[in-house]
């Protein structure tokens, strides 16, 4: 028996479906036991055993074309390895498998922000944005007055009075020294390949000590 | 933390068997493969195959159908491998060695196979 | 079966050099390919899984990178405890697989 697949790394996006693709190219065997594993760090279940969908995928999968598996509903948690075997008694090469690894795409939720109220002039200043369901990682991106903000505001001309810098992949943004032009409304936003959430609007207001 | 303790050494006689386990602890055992791997000096390691204590399933490498035998017990998560027909051929270290990755191996069993 | 050709079989380093040692594989194995390291008398320790990930305690000296039929294992500063065999392994598909083992000494 040789099998093939037509997608060995499948991405689908949560609650969507998706087909794992598992093809007999040749066998002489009429009848091959087909069992499809799931291993998740190293830990292995039985999702189709006994010709019978178990484990966490009862009621939300099925066996297409005598071999492949369609899941539907997809979770999170069904991000992982899936071996697909088969033996084939009356064949040469009675056994063959391959392994498929399935990711899962989470949105991103509305991520948590925290804008400080009101800072003095030259001090420094940190906003910070987090999320923490979407998969993959998303990059965040800070808002000000619905103005994006470049990385790092040397780069742009239009920052000059401006001394920040933006860490996309923590999503903190950082004013060494915040100036006058700095107070307005601030918010962020969390993206990834699935999908994209902000935060509400908050105020910094940027004043004088005298 | 995740232990795999091996029985001791064996010294056989050609044409018996042989049975020799592997004792599982800091982790649940039902719920990874348990592999098993020959050593021998100058042939490097060759995998024998796997057991899934879950549900007893077995995958065997062709060239150890007939020779080798695996199973598991679930109340005392220990896994034994069952090895017949011996001949100095047979003369190895029998690793047991956990999980689809092979991530953690038992001390080895010595298998001797003399008259 | 999957042929998994490892090489070299010794190897003979200084303490501070970078070491590396490869595996080919007959076919295509999809990055399942993991190494490992053996001390005389001693059962096998995973280094690297999957290629590239390094398992968890394993000092960061060791690394791995491959895809396909290629694969590498590099040392990037040969310390005298790492005197010892590797091995690399495929587990993608049909028997399991091991190379032949690199014999490592300082």
């Known amino acids: 028996v040789n099998l093939k697949s037509s997608n060995r790394t499948p991405v689908v996006q949560e609650f969507e479906s998706v087909e794992l693709s598992c093809i007999i190219t040749d066998s002489q065997t009429s009848d091959p036991r087909i069992e499809w594993k799931k291993i998740q760090d190293e830990q292995t279940t039985y999702v189709f055993f006994d010709n019978k969908i178990q484990g966490d995928l009862a009621g939300r999968a099925e066996i297409l074309g005598k071999t492949s598996l369609k899941i539907w509903n997809v979770t999170r948690r069904d991000s992982a390895l899936y071996r697909c075997e088969v033996v084939a008694r009356n064949d040469r090469k009675e056994i063959d498998e391959i392994v498929i690894e399935l990711t899962v795409q989470v949105k991103p939720v509305t991520p948590v922000c925290r804008v400080p109220k009101a800072v003095p002039v030259g001090k420094m200043a940190t906003l910070h944005c987090q999320e923490s369901e979407g998969h993959p990682r998303p990059h965040y991106s800070w808002y000000r007055n619905d103005v994006p903000l470049p990385t790092d505001s040397r780069a742009n001309p239009r920052f000059r009075n401006s001394s920040f810098h933006l860490n996309s992949e923590t999503g903190t943004l950082v004013f060494t020294a915040v100036h006058k032009d700095d107070s307005g409304q601030y918010y962020c936003i969390a993206s990834n390949d699935a999908g994209s959430a902000r935060c509400e609007e908050q105020e910094m207001e940027v004043y004088d000590l005298n | 933390q995740v232990q795999l303790q091996q029985s001791g050494a064996e010294l056989v006689k050609p044409g018996s068997s042989v049975k020799i386990s592997c004792k599982a602890s800091?982790?649940?055992?039902?719920?990874?493969?348990m592999h098993w791997i020959k050593q021998q000096p100058g042939n490097g390691l060759e995998w024998i195959g796997w057991i899934y204590p879950g549900n007893g399933n077995t995958r065997y490498n062709q060239k150890f159908n007939g020779k080798a035998t695996l199973t598991a017990d679930k109340s005392s998560s220990t896994a034994h491998m069952q090895l017949g027909s011996l001949t100095s051929e047979d003369s190895a270290v029998y690793f047991c060695?956990?999980?689809?990755?092979?991530?953690?191996w038992g001390q080895g069993v010595m298998v001797t196979v003399s008259s | 079966d999957i042929q998994m050709t490892q090489s070299p079989s010794f190897l003979s380093a200084s303490v501070g050099d970078r070491v590396t040692i490869t595996c080919k594989a007959s076919q295509n194995i999809n990055k399942y390919l993991n190494w490992y390291q053996q001390k005389l008398g001693e059962a096998p320790k995973r280094l690297i899984y999957k290629t590239n990930s390094l398992q968890t305690g394993i000092p960061s000296r060791f690394s791995g990178s491959g895809s396909g039929t290629d694969y590498t294992l590099t040392i990037s500063s040969l310390q005298p405890e790492d005197v010892a065999t590797y091995f690399c392994?495929?587990?993608?598909?049909?028997?399991?697989?091991f190379g032949g083992g690199t014999k490592l000494e300082i």
């Open positions: 060695a956990r999980g689809d990755g092979v991530d953690y």
């Open positions: 392994f495929q587990y993608n598909s049909g028997p399991r697989t």
């Open positions: 800091g982790y649940t055992f039902t719920s990874y493969d």
